[in-house]
Amino acid sequence: VPPGEDSKDVAAPHRQPLTSSERIDKQIRYILDGISALRKETCNKSNMCESSKEALAENNLNLPKMAEKDGCFQSGFNEETCLVKIITGLLEFEVYLEYLQNRFESSEEQARAVQMSTKVLIQFLQKKAKNLDAITTPDPTTNASLLTKLQAQNQWLQDMTTHLILRSFKEFLQSSLRALRQM
């Protein structure tokens, strides 16, 4: 159950409502837990998790990644630039999260929860951002053809792609969490 939707929150009216930052923090941690569960199934199913860093680096995917210029690291930290990067990155990850939807047997619901919780996180962050004009939304047509191409890959490539998406999304969220805690 995504944060803020469990019955314990409803049954505890004395508890202070979460601040916007706390809610975002809790949402990211919830998604990270979901990714861990998905990674567990992926690693149990194949030996992808032992793949060398070199092989993983040599891929045709264009997954969002934090760079120095994004202003999310301690050195050169820039709140507005960083927030734009986080939101843009999450929007770019959405097509890859859609790809994950048919990639799991026993964790199907978990994959859906990660996808839906990410949509909620984007909404939380958009409310926080002042400069929404700077956020570029991915082109739906480009996303549709990318999704088709990913789904057409051979079995080994699909497993590698799944593993890399989960690993990259985890790293992106961890960097985002650290940066948001500085805001």
């Epitope: 092989a55 045709n60 047997e105 789904q151 057409a152 051979n154 079995q155 080994w156 490539l157």
Partner: antibody, heavy 120, light 111 residues
Framework: EVQLVESGGGLVQPKGTLRLSCAAS????????MNWVRQAPGKSLEWVAR??????????YYADSVSDRVTISREDSQSMLYLQMTNLKTEDTAMYYC???????????WGQGTSVTVSS | EIVLTQSPPSLAVSLGQRATISCRAS??????????MNWFQQKSGQPPKLLIY???NQGSGVPARFSGRGSGTDFSLIIHPVEEDDTAMYFC?????????FGGGTKLEIK
């Protein structure tokens, strides 16, 4: 020993229907994606259709040239692969091969083929 | 779809010499450190037989005379030394993504 034996080919009139079968043995059929590939007389090879495994939701894929006229299916309990072909055209005349696909997308084992002739 | 252009369409090589067949892909068939290019031999009246998989690995029971090389978009099948029994059609095939595609074929003749 891996064996793939096709059947069901023959002479059929244009707009006719045919169902090809492939009996697989010598491997765990349910863990492999399977394909149909055809070869017109004196021509190159042309991939027709593919079905993946249960763990991949039995997804199916088709060549654009046949997508609205053929259906690939599998019966894991019987180790059988099928290709249902409708509204056949003269250009569908070919040898049809049942082919196993490995984890890396390699078409590693081929049956002897079944011949399909579409003619009036 | 990934288009494979094979050359030459036919080739005549003297016994014991080297035969080289090329295959060019319209886009890279390489990802995560592997090139998904395969080579098949087809003798008259027979189904294709796998010779080389993932660019350079020999299929089961394939003689060492057959080797594959290349990466990305450009690949070649080398047969050396050529034997009488190698008279056949040779096809390249990409297994990176569906639709699986094949080259137009090369007819090898032994002089």
């Amino acid at each position: 020993e891996v064996q793939l034996v096709e059947s069901g080919g023959g002479l059929v009139q244009p707009k006719g229907t045919l169902r090809l079968s492939c009996a697989a043995s010598g491997f765990s059929f349910n863990t492999y994606a399977m394909n149909w590939v055809r070869q017109a007389p004196g021509k190159s090879l042309e991939w027709v259709a593919r079905t993946v495994t249960k763990s991949n939701k039995y997804a199916t894929y088709y060549a654009d040239s046949v997508s609205d006229r053929v259906t690939i299916s599998r019966e894991d309990s019987q180790s059988m692969l099928y290709l249902q072909m409708t509204n056949l055209k003269t250009e569908d005349t070919a040898m049809y091969y049942c082919v196993r696909e490995d984890y890396y997308g390699t078409l590693d084992y081929w049956g002897q083929g079944t011949s399909v002739t579409v003619s009036s | 779809e990934i288009v494979l252009t094979q050359s030459p369409p036919s080739l005549a090589v003297s016994l014991g010499q080297r035969a080289t067949i090329s295959c060019r892909a319209s886009e890279s068939v390489h990802n995560f450190g592997i090139s998904f290019m395969n080579w098949f031999q087809q003798k008259s009246g027979q189904p294709p037989k796998l010779l080389i998989y993932t660019a350079s690995n020999q299929g089961s029971g394939v003689p060492a005379r057959f080797s594959g090389r290349g990466s990305g978009t450009d690949f070649s099948l080398i047969i050396h030394p050529v034997e009488e029994d190698d008279t056949a059609m040779y096809f390249c095939h990409q297994g990176k993504e569906v639709p699986w595609t094949f080259g137009g074929g090369t007819k090898l003749e032994i002089k």
